[in-house]
């Protein structure tokens, strides 16, 4: 027999409740706090959605980010000579996946063991503030990305140094920022041992007192503050910048450039499409939901939506792509298993050949292209 | 249309015992937290017990003034639910009603019309 | 447990009036509070749950309302089929637990 104070909390959002009932098991009897979840949470904490599904879309999210955002940090810190305020923007963006992918294998055995957190309170805030952190994070630095391409446009001029210590300036202001609005998510306990299902949950199963309106209040402010308005100025970025390629002259290589930013801004609004609109309205609603009616209807919707917001991690690298030229030469020469000081020996190699008679030697000094922006 | 019909009652002698039924229909029984709640004659609402869906492991919950007296017992397959009642004592003399818990735990709301119990020498 | 206290036994109102049912709780137990109407003879069934919101079917004359642990289920234009006790139950904490009822009587 369980005799305890069964209290109201709900998760991901679930409410479950302290309780004080007796509870027979046929395995003796404990004093304890209990927390208790209601039947549809039940469900969902013991369904394939969050057992099957989830750690599926993140182990796919884990294999493909981990490398991809890994090499992109890699080659915008060691292999780009200028450090253009994209390039900073991007690293930033790759650094902010890579530390919200990396806690992924923990967050994948979680759900594969029915959604059973056994490392820990500590483990179990990091996992939540990261996961949340990098949402927000990718939104500001895809903010940033989108303005200053299309500022490159309207003042095409040669890169300063004052321009990268204000990219640095912003990514650091970006990072305290991010810091600061997820601090509630370390602050506030995640783990709740449910002993109905036998199963510690993380973020899944909340107090009711604190989802009803804290957590309703808190991601309102995020999604208008962190996510409508940055948005706003992407689209805005992006509109304009559509207007100037519009009435820009085409030669080859503006058609070239026009083309990767159009290819750009595809993938930035699928971003927005498949992760980030999502995921932000399917948080007011859902909160919403609990704070007027006490439950949630779109629970379900709420779980998908926040689990597509991962693969951010996924299409950042698309951007990368599509921006820097560098990460374009490493990530097509990492496909082909070359390297890149092998491709340009090749290029030396056949340069040296065709122009043997007028010059006797041809070297590279340099195994790092220059990044057009 | 959510139906819940009990059965079983009638007068018994204290220190006996009954078993109560009720035949849930309109909704998918085994989806659903159920309960017992009781009336005693002229008085208030005061839960008795009450059963978890099969996520939940079937675990049942009981109050202080019933338990290791009483039993709860559901077959999902029949949506049924049950309450066994040994060593009855005058105060359990009451309406029971057999109730559902809403899915998401947000109160009680479907109850049966229920059946009466009468301990008596 | 908590305990739900519903002080009047009993409440008097003509047709057409409003009027108004308290409940207070123990102890903090958020917006967990539903209503429950009973008629004479028959079985409970609920009205509100949620403090505030009308289950399937509810006329909208039955409201609720909640400051801090007090509540409240409000008839409007009461008529003479409202007839009947009125229970409040605390849903946050289990048990789940019940005010001792309030009869609505028509003048």
């Known amino acids: 027999t369980i005799q305890g104070t069964n209290r109201s909390s709900k998760g991901r959002s679930l409410i479950g409740k302290v309780d004080g009932t007796s509870h027979v098991t046929g395995k003796g009897v404990t004093v304890e706090t209990v927390f208790s979840v209601d039947e549809f949470s039940a469900s969902v904490l013991t369904g394939k959605l969050t057992t099957v599904f989830l750690p599926i879309v993140y182990t796919i999210v884990f294999v493909v980010g981990l490398p991809s955002n890994g090499m992109a940090l890699w080659v915008f810190l060691f292999r780009t000579k200028k450090k253009h305020p994209a390039v900073i923007y991007m690293a930033n963006l790759a650094l902010a996946d890579l530390l919200s992918v990396i806690w992924f294998p923990l967050k994948i055995a979680y759900h594969i063991h029915g959604n059973n957190w056994i490392y820990g309170e500590a483990l179990c805030n990091v996992l939540i503030g990261f996961f949340y952190g990098n949402m927000y994070c990718s939104i500001l630095f895809m903010t940033c990305l989108s303005v200053q391409r299309y500022w490159v446009i309207v003042n095409p001029m040669g890169h300063s140094r004052k321009k990268a210590n204000i990219a640095i300036g912003i990514s650091l202001a970006i990072w305290l920022l991010i810091l600061l609005v997820t601090i509630p998510l370390y602050v506030v306990k995640q783990t709740i041992f449910i002993p109905a299902l036998n199963i510690t949950t993380c973020h899944d199963v909340l107090p009711e007192q604190l989802l009803v309106g804290d957590m309703f209040n808190y991601f309102l402010s995020l999604a208008i503050g962190v996510f409508l308005f940055p948005a706003f100025l992407t689209a805005s970025a992006y509109v304009l910048m559509i207007r100037m390629l519009r009435s820009s002259a085409m030669d080859e290589n503006s058609e070239k450039k026009r083309k990767r930013a159009i290819k750009l801004i595809v993938t930035v609004l699928a971003m927005y499409l498949i992760c980030f609109t999502p995921s932000n309205l399917l948080l007011v609603v859902h909160y919403f939901l609990i704070k007027s009616q006490g439950q949630s209807h779109v629970y379900a919707l709420y779980i998908v939506a926040l689990c597509l917001s991962t693969l951010n991690s996924c299409i950042d690298p698309f951007v990368y792509y599509f921006v820097s030229h560098d990460f374009r030469d490493h990530a097509k020469n990492a496909l082909l298993c070359r390297s890149v000081r092998t491709v340009k020996q090749m290029q030396v190699s056949l340069t040296s050949k065709k122009h043997s008679r007028k010059s006797s030697s041809y070297s590279s000094s340099s195994t790092t292209v220059k990044t057009s922006y | 249309e959510v139906q819940l019909i009990e059965s079983g009652g009638g007068l018994v002698q204290p220190k006996g015992s009954l078993k109560l039924s009720c035949a849930a229909s309109?909704?998918?029984?085994?989806?659903?937290?159920m309960h017992w709640v009781r009336q005693a004659p002229g008085k208030g609402l005061e839960w008795v017990a009450r059963i978890r869906s099969k996520n939940v492991h079937y675990a049942t919950y009981y109050a202080d003034s019933v338990k290791d007296r009483f039993t709860i017992s559901r077959d999902d397959s029949q949506s049924m639910l049950y309450l066994q009642m040994n060593n009855l004592k005058t105060e359990d003399t009451a309406m029971y009603f057999c109730?559902?818990?809403?899915?998401?735990?947000?109160?009680?709301?479907?109850w049966g019309q229920g059946t009466t119990l009468t301990v008596s020498s | 447990d908590i305990v739900m206290t519903q002080s009047h036994k009993f409440m008097s109102t003509s047709v057409g009036d409003r009027v108004s049912i308290t409940c207070k709780a123990s102890?903090?137990?958020?917006?967990?509070v539903a209503w429950h109407q009973q008629k004479p003879g028959q079985s409970p069934k609920l009205l509100i749950y949620?403090?505030?919101n009308r289950h399937t079917g509810v006329p909208d004359r039955f409201t609720g309302r909640r400051s801090g642990t007090d509540f409240t289920l409000t008839i409007s234009n009461v008529q003479s089929e409202d007839l009947a006790d009125y229970f409040c139950q605390q849903y946050s904490t289990y048990p789940f637990t019940f005010g001792s009822g309030t009869k609505l009587e028509i003048k």
């Open positions: 949620w403090t505030s």
């Open positions: 109730v559902r818990e809403d899915y998401y735990g947000s109160s009680y709301d479907y």
């Open positions: 102890q903090d137990v958020g917006s967990a």
């Open positions: 309109g909704f998918t029984f085994n989806s659903y937290a």
